[in-house]
Structure formats: C-alpha cells, structure tokens
C-alpha cells in the first residue's frame, strides 16, 4: 500500500498530464486530487505511465469509489483496465458498447480472459440482454467470448441473434452453454430448407437431444467426424448403426479413427457386434451374439 | 408407448409454492425438450416453460420471476414450481412433450398428460 | 409476445357439414403453426404442424392451410367426434402463445 504524505507546493497537480511521469509512486499518491483523475480520465491512456504508476492510480480511484467505478471512468481506463481484477469489474454497471469495444482492444494479448467474462457479463446485465449489437460486437472484437459467458446469461439471447453468431464463436463452448443456444438455434432456424439448415445448425448440435439427431439422419446431410464427435453422448448411444451410417454418409469410414475416443467407444458398447460388422469397418467391442440387452433405465420407468 | 403423468397437491394456498411433478413412464426423458403448460378453468392454453434433461430451461417471461423447473433424469421425472401464487394461478397444469423433430423443425407438443387441476384457496 | 386471435369464439355447425375456424397472428409466424383439439376432461390432442402438415393418425377430413398471419382449419365433414373446442398455437418465437379457442357445436 502506497504510504500517505503531504504533496510538496511545486508538485501540486492542476490537470493529468505527461509532467506526471515524473513524479514517484507516493507523489502521485499524495498530489493528484482523485476527482480530478476521474474527471480527466481520457487523457491517461496517452501518459507513458509505469505499471507502478498505474497501481497508484487505480488506487485512487478505488478510493473515490469504492462502489465501482461510474461508466464514464471505465470507458476511458484504458491500459489501466489491465490492473482490473475480476472483483473490481464486479461492482461495474456497464451498458454502452463503445466501453466494451475500447476495453476489448485493450486485453488483446494479454492474460485477461477472467477479466474480459466479467466484464461481457457486466455488460450483458447492463444492457438487459445480450442483444444483436453485443453480440456482433463480441464476434468482431473477442472471437470466443461469448463462450465465456454463464448458461444463465446465454439464456437472455433472442433467438433472432442467433444467426449473427459464427461457427468460431461456439469453439470453447461446453455442453452447457449448448444446450441453451441449440434450442434457440433450432428455432431461428426453423423456417429454412434442409440442407441450409444443417450448415447452420451443425455448429449448435453438441445441445442437440437423440430425437434431432435421429431426424438428421434421414436427410442425407453426411455430417462430418468432427461434429459427430461434439454431440452429446447420450444423443449418441440410442442410434441404431443404420442411423449412424445414414447420418455419417460417406464419413462413416472415420468412426474407425475414434473408435477407441467418446462418444464413439461408448456407443460401440451399446450396439450388437453382428450390427457393426455390417459396416465394414472392423469395429470391435460391440454385444456378442446371442447377448439379451435389458433397458433397465426403461424398466425403471415404468415401476 | 411414452406416457406423462402428472402429480402433486390439488389444493395450495395464496403466496405459497405449487410444486408438481410430471413423470415420464415407457422412455428416456434425455431424448426430447419437456414442457409445462396450465388452462385455467374455461379458458384457454398458457405455456409456462420447458426443460431439456440436462437441466437447461426456458419459460414465459409473464411468468419467469415465480417459475422454477427442474430435472431428475434418474427417476424419468421434470418437476414445476410456481412461487407465490394467487387465485389466478388456478387452473390445469399438463406436462407435455415438444415434438423434437428437426424433420418439421418445431415447438409443438405431440404428448400431454392427462392434467391436473391445481386450485389456489385459503 | 406474439398474440393470437381465434374467430368465431363458438361456430355451430350441422353434423355432415364443413366447418372453418380461423386464427390470426399479431405479426407473421411464417408456417410455424399448429393446431390442437380439445375435448371436456381431456389434454388437447395435436392435429396440424407446419400450419398444414396433418399429425399422425388424424383423419384426412382435418386439412390447415394459411401462412404469415391469417391461418384456417377446415374440418370437410363434420363427425359427431369432431365437436370440441380447437386452438391455434404459434412457435415461430417464445413465449410460445395460443389463441383463446373456437367451440365447435352441434347445430
């Protein structure tokens, strides 16, 4: 913690400027006025200040307000965002998109995915909702981000946003945040022909549930491994083999290359043995012949 | 042959929770997208909201506030809260099943339980 | 919200005859709707998706036809089985709404 004294006559600062990066960590301390800074914030972004200099800085700002800083400090932080711990972002109220812009810029290339998440997420509170414009601005500035988010923010999407998002934006998202965008991708979807409708709904599909994926499998839309790989497994392990091998098309042939990988081991182990070998592929694992397969998840059920 | 069945107390009173559980008997609840929608008496459909197995749900934003669904994929079941409630909230709640075929992409309920009225009282 | 309206509120119609129910739709719901029937003490049952793709086992009789906004069932041939209550559903965008219902009576 930066200790206090009183700022000597000569040093008493009037406006943020570049003389300021003279002055040591405890000058700055004690001779800027914390209202000032707040009020002249634009202009610290173009001060060659030391990363010591910046901790002072955010330390009066800290102290001015201890509630969070108002929106008008934040969208001029600048290269003082990088001090920002995801607690500090926390008590923002973020709602313009010109902030998020400014601040995105400023994290790129550095280790601040923590912070960047809080901050969408403050964003998307902010806003109410993650709207058209968050959203292509997430796109554009921050590929990947909108995976950062919670399911429960990915929850106020519109489904009418949806076909703003890209294939690359859905590559860190987990199943989680998959199962609340499929269902509103499906539905933005929904009035398109087939075959266009898998260009867009293959990025979503690792949300989809068995009853899609087995419609799916009677359009000939020869899904390639590696969506395959990404759906769910249990979406997988009730498909027949003759469901996979009209899903797959001629990419069935890879099933051979992950076989021994999830979900395609898990459902090797559900089908029968004389069912595989009808692929051709020398799949191993399956159900001897002869073997009585009991549903017992069915008979529970019903009990 | 997939069936719902609603269950759960007939009788709640005002600004207490109603709680009701649908259970899925003769298949797997992992397969589709499971709603609850009410009627109240004479009148006609609201949806309240779904559920997909893996706990991820949607419901009416005029309801959103007071609405909890949740999921127990070991005993086939989808269960609905409803906090608060007041007269108004009197009426037949049925669980039913989205459709959940991309072949006719839609949101449309092709299996309902039998319902099962719900009066708010003191 | 996407509100749906339903006319006529009751039609009465003669056993034998045809009958046609409307449904209106605040702002276009493309063909994302479905029809439903619904008899006393009983769940809606689903006769029409896709605005005029006929469900599974329902009779040929049942025919939807509409798109945008202004929907139609028509039942050709009245059966005495047929007089019940009918909703029109959209699922173009959530909430997923209904309309109020047409009751389908014996003239």
């Known amino acids: 913690d930066v200790e206090r004294t009183t700022c000597p006559p000569e040093k008493e600062v009037h406006e943020i400027d570049e003389s300021l990066i003279f002055y040591k960590k405890r000058e700055l301390e004690a001779c800027v006025d914390a209202a000032l800074l707040a009020a002249q914030m634009d202009r610290v972004d173009a001060i060659p200040f030391t990363y010591e200099q910046l901790d002072v800085l955010k330390h009066k700002l800290d102290e001015l307000y201890p509630q969070g800083y108002p929106e008008s400090v934040i969208r001029h932080l600048g290269h003082l965002f990088l001090k920002m711990s995801p607690e500090d972002i926390r008590k923002w109220n973020v709602t313009s998109l010109e902030t998020l812009k400014a601040l995105l810029k400023v994290s790129k290339g550095h280790e601040m995915s923590a912070q960047v998440a809080t901050l969408i997420d403050r964003v998307v509170v902010g806003r109410g909702q993650l709207d058209k414009d968050t959203v292509d601005t997430l796109t554009a500035f921050c590929p990947g981000c909108l995976c950062s988010l919670s399911p429960e923010r990915l929850s106020s999407v519109p489904p009418s946003v949806i076909g703003a998002v890209r294939p690359q934006d859905l590559d860190t998202c987990g199943p989680r945040q998959l199962d609340v965008l499929y269902p509103k991708a499906r539905l933005a979807f929904q009035n398109m022909s087939g075959s266009e409708y898998f260009v867009k709904i293959r990025p979503f599909l690792g949300g989809a549930p068995t009853e899609d994926v087995k419609a799916l499998s009677q359009q000939n839309v020869s899904m390639d491994l590696a969506t395959f790989m990404k759906l769910r497994r249990e979406a997988v392990l009730p498909l027949t083999v003759a469901e996979v091998q009209k899903l797959l098309g001629p990419h069935v042939e890879g099933l051979k290359v992950e076989e021994q990988h999830s979900p395609v081991r898990d459902w090797i182990l559900k089908q029968r043995q004389d069912d595989l070998d009808t692929l051709g592929l020398g799949l191993q694992g399956g159900i001897p012949n002869g073997y009585l397969i009991l549903d017992l998840s069915v008979r529970e059920a019903l009990s | 042959q997939v069936q719902l069945q609603e269950s759960g107390p007939g009788l709640v009173k005002p600004s207490e929770t109603l709680s009701l559980t649908c259970t899925v008997s003769?298949?797997?609840?992992?397969?589709?997208?499971w709603s609850w929608v009410r009627q109240p008496p004479g009148k006609g459909l609201e949806w309240i909201g779904y559920?997909?197995?893996?706990?991820?749900?949607n419901s009416n934003p005029s309801l959103k506030s007071r609405v909890i669904i949740s999921v127990d994929t070991s005993k086939n079941q989808f269960s609905l809260k409803l906090s608060s409630v007041t007269a108004a909230d009197t009426a037949v709640y049925y669980c039913?099943?989205?459709?959940?075929?991309?072949?006719?992409?839609?949101?449309?309920?092709?299996?309902w339980g039998r319902g099962t009225l719900v009066t708010v009282s003191s | 919200e996407i509100v749906m309206t339903q006319s006529p509120a009751t039609l009465s119609v003669s056993p034998g005859e045809r009958a046609t129910l409307s449904c209106r739709a605040s702002?276009?719901?493309?063909?994302?709707l479905a029809w439903y029937q619904q008899k006393p003490g009983q769940a809606p049952r689903l006769l029409i998706y896709?605005?005029?793709t006929r469900a599974t086992g329902i009779p040929a009789r049942f025919s939807g036809s509409g798109s945008g906004t202004e929907f139609t069932l028509t039942i050709s041939s009245l059966q005495s089985e047929d007089f019940a209550v009918y909703y029109c559903?959209?699922?173009?965008?959530?909430?997923?709404?209904f309309g109020q219902g047409t009751r389908l009576e014996i003239k």
């Open positions: 039913a099943r989205e459709v959940g075929r991309i072949a006719v992409a839609g949101w449309f309920f092709d299996l």
């Open positions: 003769g298949g797997s609840i992992n397969n589709y997208y």
């Open positions: 559920i997909f197995y893996s706990g991820s749900t």
């Open positions: 702002q276009s719901v493309n063909s994302n």
């Open positions: 896709g605005a005029s």
């Open positions: 559903q959209q699922y173009n965008n959530w909430p997923l709404t």
